[in-house]
């Protein structure tokens, strides 16, 4: 069976069908670079005005417009409010009320595209094998990112969340059209890793979402997480206004000269630095998203209430702070390098500021106690990656499943560690599952390209795309249309329940409390340590234009010096953890 | 400017089945969608479904597929609806109407048609 | 598909008086769009994308709303604004409200 000409709300589309054999029978319906939005620079999106006419959705279109890897010129264009869909349809009838499965992709809130990196015409995000494999619809889009996605001038002449409302704006135009490509538009499951992890947590707080999103999945990333929330977005605005020539004393004329900047040189005047900084990499992630008091009307950990009836699966990679670490300290991934204890001290303090001396010598002591016993580079090097997992992914994605769990009404709370090691031969022996690495498994890619893979990876790939998907069609990832390996049993306060996600999953392969000494640190022994004002001076960004990184300012609840006052925004961190 | 012509009334035997016609004019009849649109005064205005003229794609409300049929002839600019095995549910005004672009409303509307079921 | 509920169903208002209907949807929409009919002619496009007025509705006429919840109004009724008026949402089954029909007193 297959559909054909589709009608939406702005006219009709029509894909292509692709047979998943020669014989006939099973096939899957795809739709590439359907238009759900446009947008102007630095404007929140409005819908489409529509066409007349059939349009021929059958290629990709382009990312939004990001720099490249270099961060030396750019790619992609402003016209890219585009999604994509795979339909998988049996034999005879056409599919009707499938679950719907809508991808968020990550890259920093600054880089990604609905369809990801593409090698040879094979695209990391390409919905069929989850499709097909699960009997879900997949929906993937592109979101603006960087700059042009989240600059906010922390007021209302330029609020930001552009980005943020990009992906609503595509979670909205499902929940209205997918029916007609057979989908249940009461059955959406938003999911998304890394900044696409923390968007879709973004998504479940915002009201103006209420009723459209029935589940959720956050692989690696969270609202809460230190990185996903910009404190001082002024600091930044005025940073790009000034490299491209804009006025920065009156906000209204700042936002009104950024508008009719070129968006490639609003998009490269912002670089990431990836040589070791002053401060951990995530603290120059500039463009991300902000409490603006209307899309995130409040900070994110007193909007709980909004996902009393979403069914929710968080969890993370068991060494997702790897990358992170080969830049803040780059001796973790070379073997002839050693990690020294001033390393790590520096590591630490730059993610503890707010608590002062204390708070780094207490977070120092508590990652470094096994250190005395086992002094070896291996060890020492894994405490770097397990702190930066612990800071940056673990204990935010735990506040997070206890926060949804104490929220709930009807909404079920799982949680997962993905284990399954890391295939980079350039890797430490040591390794385990690196940020990112669980996105070729939850995409099929070990059926897809079967010559890259051993069995061990399908066994994985397989066990993650039946429970995400029965977890779609349901609310249980156990229950649904695909077999799973062990019974995966709901997240609990008492508990903390979770599923380790490795190549051979048993009944041991639920456990309970992850690291439960160090969530107990940050959760109380770090929480009630006094916050300190950090030094005013150490916040002037340097007159040279031509400088990467100005030092990231923050307000006193974050891991960052305090900000000039000017810049400051109101709504403050919760005090759940001093980040 | 732009105008829709429909007969004014079709009257026809329970059982039988009816094809409606839309004269288009006064723009390019393969260019826009067309509606249809049943109206009674129980149930209001119900969107029966669109074709577009310039190919033959149809989308029907689940409500109406095997209820109506919709096609055009681009020789003449006329859009048709084909209602089979009728009976007095079937009877009200029913308008075909064209976009007035994309995704905004219907913008122009004809004159409607009203179809009695009777014996 | 996405359900429209109008209220009032039925309505009366003097001259000079000012006039709002509802029109609730069943779950989120972009835009809410308005017609009106008079007895014996087809409906009209009058007001589009929730807030704009057809050409040659009068300015007394607006609209307003997002999400689930959109209305329209008229700022001073006049005898010639008698008539039944219909929402309508466009996703990929459009639908329409039962109407509102506003007599005047």
């Known amino acids: 069976a297959k559909l054909g000409a589709v009608y939406t709300e702005g006219g009709f589309v029509e894909g292509v069908n692709k047979k998943l054999s020669l014989l006939g029978g099973d096939s899957v319906d795809i739709f590439k670079g359907i238009p759900f939005a446009t947008a102007k620079t630095l404007e929140n999106p409005q819908r489409h005005p529509g066409w007349q006419g059939t349009l021929k959705a059958t290629n990709f279109k382009k990312r939004c417009l990001q720099a490249t890897i270099t961060q030396d010129n750019t790619y992609g264009q402003e016209d890219c409010l585009y999604l994509n869909i795979w339909v998988p349809q049996g034999r005879k009838q056409v599919s009707h009320n499938l679950p719907v499965m809508v991808w968020i992709y990550g890259g920093a809130f600054l880089m990604g595209s609905g369809q990801g990196a593409n090698f040879l015409k094979n695209y990391l995000y390409d919905g069929e094998e989850i499709a097909t494999r699960g009997n879900v619809i997949v929906v993937t889009f592109n979101y603006r990112v960087g700059p042009l996605g989240f600059l906010s001038t922390g007021d209302a002449n330029l609020p930001g969340n552009f980005g943020l409302r990009d992906q609503h704006m595509a979670i909205a135009w499902v929940k209205r059209n997918i029916a007609a490509f057979g989908g249940d538009p009461d059955n959406i499951t938003i999911f998304g890793e890394s900044a696409g992890a923390a968007s879709v947590s973004l998504q479940t707080l915002s009201p103006y979402n209420k009723g459209l999103i029935r589940r959720a999945i956050s692989q690696s990333g969270m609202a809460l997480s230190p990185w996903a929330i910009q404190k001082n977005p002024l600091f930044w605005a005025k940073t790009i206004a000034k490299k491209v020539g804009c006025p920065t004393e009156d906000t209204g004329k700042m936002a009104a000269c950024l508008k009719i900047t070129d968006p490639r040189a609003l998009t490269l005047a912002y670089k990431l630095p990836v040589k070791k900084q002053e401060y951990p990499v995530v603290h120059y992630l500039a463009f991300i998203p902000v409490i603006d008091g209307d899309f995130i009307p409040d900070d994110p950990i007193n909007l709980y209430n909004n996902t009393a009836d979403i069914d929710y699966i968080a969890g993370i990679n068991n060494m997702d702070g790897h990358l992170f670490a080969t830049i803040d300290v780059p001796a973790v991934d070379k073997t002839k390098q050693t990690v020294t204890e001033e390393d790590f001290y520096r590591l630490v303090s730059g993610h503890t500021v707010a608590k002062g001396l204390k708070g780094a010598q207490a977070t120092f002591d508590i990652y470094t106690e096994s250190w005395a016993q086992d002094p070896s580079q291996e060890n020492m090097k894994k405490t770097v990656v397990a702190f930066e997992t612990d800071v940056l992914f673990l204990i935010p994605t735990e506040i997070a499943l206890a926060q949804h769990k104490a929220h709930a009404k009807s909404a079920k709370t799982y949680s997962y560690l993905f284990s399954h090691p890391s295939r980079m031969p350039i890797y430490p022996k040591w390794m385990g599952a690196d940020h990112a690495d669980d996105l070729q498994y939850v995409f099929g890619k070990p059926f897809a390209t079967p010559l890259g893979y051993r069995p061990q990876d399908r066994a994985v790939s397989k066990a993650m795309i039946a429970y995400w998907t029965n977890f779609a069609r349901s609310g249980d990832p156990n229950m649904g249309n695909s077999p799973v390996p062990t019974h995966w049993y709901p997240y609990t306060l008492e508990n903390g329940n979770y599923l380790d996600i490795t190549k051979t999953i048993t009944s041991a392969s639920m456990k309970e409390h992850l690291r439960e000494k160090f969530l107990k640190f940050w959760a109380v022994t770090f929480e009630v340590l006094p916050t300190v004002t950090g030094d005013q001076d150490t916040l002037t960004p340097p007159e040279d234009d031509s400088e990467v990184a100005p030092d990231p300012p923050s307000d006193d609840s974050q891991v960052v010096p305090v900000p000039p006052t000017d810049d400051s925004v109101e709504a403050q961190m919760p005090a759940t953890i001093g980040f | 400017q732009v105008q829709l012509q429909q007969p004014g009334a079709e009257l026809v035997k329970p059982g039988a089945s009816v094809k409606m016609s839309c004269k288009a004019s006064g723009y390019t009849f393969t260019s826009y969608n067309m509606h249809w649109v049943k109206q009674t005064p129980g149930q209001g205005l119900e969107w029966i479904g669109v074709?577009?003229?310039?190919?033959?794609?149809?989308s029907y409300n689940q409500k109406f597929k095997g209820k109506a049929t919709l096609t055009a002839d681009k020789s003449s600019s006329t859009a048709y609806m084909q209602l089979s095995s009728l009976t007095s549910e079937d009877s009200a005004v029913y308008y075909c109407?064209?976009?007035?672009?994309?995704?905004?409303?219907?913008?122009?509307w004809g004159q409607g048609t009203t179809l009695t079921v009777s014996s | 598909q996405i359900v429209l509920t109008q209220s009032p169903a039925v309505m009366s208002a003097s001259p000079g008086e000012k006039v709002t209907m509802t029109c609730s949807a069943s779950?989120?929409?972009?835009?809410m769009h308005w017609y009106q009919q008079k007895p014996g002619t087809s409906p009209k496009r009058w007001i589009y994308?929730?807030?704009k007025l057809a050409s040659g509705v009068p300015a007394r006429f607006s609209g307003s709303g997002s999400g689930t919840s959109y209305s329209l109004t008229i700022s001073s009724m006049e005898a010639e604004d008698a008539a039944t008026y219909y929402c309508h949402q466009r996703s990929s089954y459009p639908t329409f409200g039962g109407g509102t029909k506003l007599e005047i007193k």
């Open positions: 074709i577009y003229p310039g190919n033959g794609d149809t």
């Open positions: 109407a064209r976009d007035y672009y994309g995704s905004s409303p219907l913008g122009y």
């Open positions: 779950s989120s929409i972009s835009y």
């Open positions: 994308d929730t807030s």
